[in-house]
């Protein structure tokens, strides 16, 4: 997290806000609900209280405007700048302005007013932008999904550094951004994508360019807004420029940033039995056109060319790949080796000699 220079903050805990005008995109009650919910994000974790005024001067004046709207920080038409807010202080201090050239919504369409407002009110309270891609105060807008919003840990630490904790946090689970060099790190899925490696963990993935040591961290939804926050497995089919992503009983085919029509599909359409609730890992072999799908202690082999499951499957993981354990969290193939991830450990397995050749920490893939 980052606070503003000179640690600008309110010297009182009871703050007022006023909605000066409304966007035509939403009903008045939807706008009011979005702002109330956005303030609650911050009051839940601090001693701050927010009271709405219907007239007069409030600490935080909220308005919608377009282009030059009276503060010498003009908006720029659709997309680009969405909103801005001033840090704590008199006059403009704390005020939040929203660009009415955007389409404001209470859903995933356009820009979600609650999410943008919660971010802007962070500024109104003294938080600057965060470098943590998982933080609400990260400067890039990402719709995080319909489920109950949980304020990330980085933002909690930031706001509590200014105002201290509240009496009781109604939602004490604050998601932490994974640390790639945590020795206990386990991974959810790994796939190549157009020459890069994508390493998924929780609602994030690291993006690793070849010949590069520093992996970039992204929210999965910043790449693919329509995908679930977390995924179970992934593999690339390079000759078709597609990647396949699995979550629960569903899977998606993606061409770059775009989901193919007709997806998601059910994993049972691949020929998996109905009892299979999820795929834990998947890896594709371009030379044979086969894909291994792991679930529980079993492995299936799918023929991507003829779109059928191979006979004689499923088989036990321990029988086909002795020594790697009875589950696979994530897997990828490179230069004749399969890399199996099981908890905080990865096994380098030689396809040619059919045996484990190295055991390494899982996060050595991230150069830790």
């Amino acid at each position: 997290y980052n606070v503003f220079p000179r640690t600008l903050k309110w010297s009182k805990m009871n703050l007022t806000y006023r909605i000066v005008n409304y966007t035509p995109d939403m009903t008045h009650s939807e706008v009011e609900k979005a702002f109330k919910k956005a303030f609650k994000v911050w009051s839940d974790v601090t001693p701050l209280n927010f009271t709405r005024l219907h007239d007069g001067i409030a600490d935080i004046m909220i308005s919608f405007g377009i282009k030059e709207h009276g503060d010498f920080y003009p908006f720029d038409g659709p997309s680009g700048l969405l909103a801005h807010a001033f840090p704590p202080g008199p006059n403009y201090g704390g005020d939040a302005h929203f660009d009415d050239d955007e389409t404001w919504t209470s859903s995933s369409k356009g820009y979600n007013l609650f999410l943008v407002a919660a971010h802007e009110f962070g500024h109104s309270l003294g938080l600057d932008h965060s470098k943590d891609p998982g933080a609400l105060m990260f400067p890039i807008y990402t719709y995080t999904g319909k489920s109950h919003f949980m304020l990330p840990d980085d933002d909690v630490q930031g706001i509590q550094s200014l105002y201290g904790p509240g009496d009781e946090d109604p939602n004490p689970k604050h998601p932490k951004t994974p640390d790639k060099c945590d020795p206990s790190l386990s991974l959810d899925a790994i796939t190549s994508l157009r020459g890069e490696t994508m390493i998924f963990k929780d609602r994030f993935f690291w993006r690793l360019h070849p010949q590069q040591v520093d992996a970039e961290l992204f929210l999965t939804k910043s790449f693919w807004p329509e995908l679930p926050n977390r995924i179970d497995a992934a593999y690339e089919h390079p000759s078709h420029d597609l990647i396949f992503i699995f979550r629960g009983r569903k899977f998606w085919a993606l061409n770059g940033y775009d989901i193919l029509e007709g997806y998601p599909k059910k994993i049972s359409e691949l020929g998996l039995p109905k009892e299979v609730k999820k795929i834990s890992a998947a890896v594709h072999f371009e030379d044979t056109g086969k894909t291994l799908l792991f679930s529980g202690n079993q492995v299936w082999r799918y023929d991507d060319t003829n779109h059928i499951m191979d006979k004689d499957y499923p088989r036990l993981i321990e029988e086909d790949f002795p020594g790697i354990g009875d589950k696979v969290d994530a897997v990828y193939e490179k230069n004749g080796y399969i890399y199996f991830f099981n908890g905080p450990i990865q096994f380098e397995y030689s396809i040619w000699s059919n045996r484990i050749v190295r055991v390494m920490p899982a996060n050595s893939i991230l150069w830790c």
Epitope: S222, D258, L260
Partner: nanobody
């Protein structure tokens, strides 16, 4: 419905630069990813570069560090800045919105001579 029109390509010496643009008609351009593909004679069409709605970029390994993709949603235009061009970059370049199942331009020829 989105119509895409690429700018004229051109011929350039190896090591030179070229900028392609892709003009989109229709106000929905900003809702789609924007990509460039290319096809060299006798070869399959291949992905070159892409930029998401949220402006996250992605490049083929062969062009990374030399090519830069960008977009201007207000103007409805996408760009591909190509530097340090090589003879193997010679191809017809296609602008695309929305991926393989999306919208395509008619293509523009880029020739790099040694």
């Amino acid at each position: 419905e989105v119509q895409l029109v690429e700018s004229e390509g051109g011929s350039v010496q190896a090591g030179g630069s070229l900028r392609l643009s892709c003009a989109a008609s229709g106000s929905t351009f900003s809702r789609y990813s924007m990509n460039w593909y290319r096809q060299a004679p006798g070869k399959q069409r291949e992905f070159v570069a892409g930029i998401s709605v949220g402006r996250i970029t992605n490049y083929a390994v062969s062009v990374r560090g030399r090519f830069t993709i960008s977009r201007d949603n207000a103007e409805g235009t996408g760009y591909l800045q190509m530097n340090s061009l090589k003879p193997e970059d010679t191809a017809v370049y296609y602008c695309n919105a929305g991926g393989l199942q999306g919208y395509w331009g008619l293509g523009t020829q880029v020739t790099v001579s040694s």
